[in-house]
């Protein structure tokens, strides 16, 4: 449905508040270094222009595309060359190349200061003084640090952020009310950002077909009673939504996501019995709720898959007639029967089935050739099952912190060239799989664990892509989206790695460690552990454990000392010497 003015269309559909919020998110995700005030000014200018187009769609420039309007606005920033360097060259290009250029310059790890949370009273005063600016600042700070954050979902986070302050700034104990809510929003926000980053990577690096396959599998697990036609329609619409958001088309994305939620709720009888509560909520909550809804129960009496996909005489005929549709049907039928499998496992099975049909449908006796295809699935299913069983046992034995340390050592030995902060961040997140998934019963462990690991390993892939240092990481990240985790799991110690030179400064600690939160202290110790492995990749678990135990005792001792700084200086030297001796450095 062509509109005379796209900007007027979206303004009317979304309303002024959402329009302004989404434009701010879009601008902050593109120009991540620009000050807040500059972005607010640009957003206000765009909003005023949109209002003139609503009043008269034939007014000057109202017929321009959103990319043209937004790109022109971004290119008016005076300090573009000084702040962003070669990104300024994007402005010499025409649409659609200009937008593609901006997208390529999005930075997953921007050089921005860590967000420090002010005192509760300070935050509440700021909230009461100017609620609108306070909430815009939240959108801005999250969007610029997470340039692929799912924009309509960020509006939902902002709504919860506002609700937390509205409630807690009136409470008797503001901090007790507010801080847990902010912690929860922060943790959920990081998880949401990482999940969306994988969707965008899937679309951008592996194409629409890869994303659609993921969506068929996931939606078939979630809506096993829905017909294939219904799932296909939802997949098409969902792909459009995520393509738009990942492409920076945030107004279209939010608008289409609202339409999709409306459609799902109007057709819930033929989609899922679990949607009733979600569909009674307001728009932002409704969309979020649908995205997180539990799997519906499987239909009764589903027949064996073999009847359609192995025993039928028409397998090759059906495959030849419409390959992707037939493979989509296979994926749909397999996934709706297996909520206990991870999506990536289902995609591996579909790939194996496709490869088998490609080979067998060209053979003299196709049926004889593909008759045992389901037997090939067994090892593919058992591999993640065994891996999860082993790692959950290890997690239960060690607890989260020590489990993270085991993973830190494992991954540093696999890819020691990767930067220490990245190894720490990724290994800590990998380690969280234990508390997140091991508590689940067998039937829920694999989808929880392996699909979560896909999200975390994608963080490694996008961070590594910015500054590639390891051919092994590049290979695992680029060869196959669904085999990333098995690829990393299969990596052994990198024998080609030349150990890092010993630098005493890396292992010098000061009294400031004593005032850090438990989490920050853990990160300091884990950073030291990674550096230790980089210096001595052949160190045994026992050697590393001994050194880390000594280190923990050293920190505890000096933090209790009267003259902390002297203790850290003197005892630190002794610890370094003892560690060098223990590890033969």
């Amino acid at each position: 449905d062509a509109h005379k003015s796209e900007v007027a269309h979206r303004f009317k559909d979304l309303g002024e508040e959402n329009f302004k919020a989404l434009v701010l998110i879009a601008f902050a995700q593109y120009l991540q270094q620009c000050p807040f005030e500059d972005h607010v000014k640009l957003v206000n200018e765009v909003t005023e222009f949109a209002k003139t187009c609503v009043a008269d769609e034939s007014a000057e420039n109202c017929d321009k595309s959103l990319h043209t309007l937004f790109g022109d606005k971004l290119c008016t920033v005076a300090t573009l060359r000084e702040t962003y360097g070669e990104m300024a060259d994007c402005c010499a290009k025409q649409e659609p190349e200009r937008n593609e250029c901006f997208l390529q310059h999005k930075d997953d790890n921007p050089n921005l200061p860590r967000l420090v949370r002010p005192e509760v009273d300070v935050m509440c005063t700021a909230f009461h003084d100017n609620e609108e600016t306070f909430l815009k600042k939240y959108l801005y700070e999250i969007a610029r640090r997470h340039p692929y954050f799912y924009a309509p979902e960020l509006l939902f986070f902002a709504k919860r952020y506002k609700a937390a302050f509205t409630e807690c700034c009136q409470a008797a104990d503001k901090a007790a009310c507010l801080l847990p809510k902010l912690d929860e929003l922060r943790d959920e926000g990081k998880a949401s950002s990482a999940k969306q980053r994988l969707k965008c990577a899937s679309l951008q690096k592996f194409g629409e077909r890869a994303f659609k396959a993921w969506a068929v599998a996931r939606l078939s697990q979630r809506f096993p009673k829905a017909e294939f036609a219904e799932v296909s329609k939802l997949v098409t619409d969902l792909t459009k939504v995520h393509t738009e958001c990942c492409h920076g088309d945030l107004l279209e994305c939010a608008d289409d996501r609202a339409d999709l939620a409306k459609y799902i709720c109007e057709n819930q009888d033929s989609i899922s019995s679990k949607l009733k509560e979600c569909c009674e909520k307001p728009l932002l909550e409704k969309s979020h709720c649908i995205a997180e809804v539990e799997n519906d129960e499987m239909p009764a009496d589903l027949p064996s898959l073999a009847a359609d996909f192995v025993e039928s005489k028409d397998v090759c005929k059906n495959y030849a007639e419409a390959k992707d549709v037939f493979l989509g049907m296979f994926l749909y039928e397999y996934a709706r029967r297996h909520p206990d499998y991870s999506v990536v496992l289902l995609l591996r099975l579909a790939k194996t089935y496709e490869t088998t049909l490609e080979k067998c449908c060209a053979a003299a006796d196709p049926h004889e050739c593909y008759a045992k295809v389901f037997d090939e699935f067994k090892p593919l299913v058992e591999e993640p099952q065994n891996l999860i069983k082993q790692n959950c046992e290890l997690f239960e034995q060690l607890g989260e912190y020590k489990f993270q340390n085991a993973l830190l050592v494992r991954y540093t030995k696999k890819v020691p060239q990767v930067s220490t902060p990245t190894l720490v961040e990724v290994s800590r997140n990998l380690g969280k799989v234990g508390s997140k998934c091991c508590k689940h019963p067998e039937a829920k462990r694999m989808p929880c664990a392996e699909d979560y690991l896909s999200v975390v390993l994608n963080q490694l892939c996008v961070l590594h892509e910015k500054t590639p240092v390891s051919d092994r990481v590049t290979k695992c990240c680029t060869e196959s989206l669904v085999n990333r985790r098995p690829c990393f799991s299969a990596l052994e110690v990198d024998e080609t790695y030349v150990p890092k030179e010993f630098n005493a400064e890396t292992f010098t600690f000061h009294a400031d460690i004593c005032t850090l939160s438990e989490k920050e202290r853990q990160i300091k110790k884990q950073t030291a552990l990674v550096e230790l492995v980089k210096h001595k990749p052949k160190a045994t678990k026992e050697q590393l454990k001994a050194v880390m135990d000594d280190f923990a005792a050293f920190v505890e001792k000096c933090c209790k000392a009267d003259d902390k700084e002297t203790c850290f200086a003197e005892e630190g030297k002794k610890l370094v010497a003892a560690s060098q001796a223990a590890l033969g450095l």
């Epitope: 009673k225 017909e227 294939f228 036609a229 296909s232 009888d269 033929s270 239909p299 009764a300 009496d301 589903l302 027949p303 064996s304 898959l305 009847a307 359609d308 996909f309 025993e311 039928s312 028409d314 059906n318 549709v325 037939f326 049907m329 749909y332 039928e333």
Partner: nanobody, 118 residues
Framework: EVQLQESGGGLVEPGGSLRLSCVAS????????MSWVRQAPGKGLEWVSS????????SYADSVKGRFTMSRDNAKNTLYLQLNSLKSEDTAMYYC???????????LGQGTLVTVSS
């Protein structure tokens, strides 16, 4: 507009056979599992059988298992139900419907009447 046109019903003696057909239009036939349901005089709707999207997988109500066979021809957008060893209790209006084991009301065609009587 979704349309389902059933045919093939008639009067048959106990132990006899019939073949029902259902021609579908207005939707992508091969993207839907399909079912047959029936309604005996003065009774509610009863599920008879279902077939998967590709057509290899089928499921039958206990009352018709071993006597009825369901199939489909996706190229012709047509659904079939072969009725063998018919009994008087099979007398009903037979409808084809979209979906596997339909447990929610769905739009029905005109139906085709099967009468088993000596």
């Amino acid at each position: 507009e979704v349309q389902l046109q059933e045919s093939g019903g008639g009067l048959v003696e106990p132990g006899g056979s019939l073949r029902l057909s259902c021609v579908a239009s207005g939707f992508t036939f091969q993207h839907y599992a399909m079912s047959w349901v029936r309604q005996a005089p003065g009774k509610g709707l009863e599920w008879v059988s279902s077939i998967s999207i590709v057509g290899g997988g089928t499921s039958y109500a206990d009352s018709v298992k071993g006597r009825f066979t369901m199939s489909r021809d996706n190229a012709k957008n047509t659904l079939y139900l072969q009725l063998n060893s018919l009994k008087s209790e099979d007398t009903a209006m037979y409808y084809c419907v979209r979906g596997w084991h339909p447990d929610v009301p769905r739009p029905l065609g005109q139906g085709t009447l099967v009468t088993v009587s000596s």
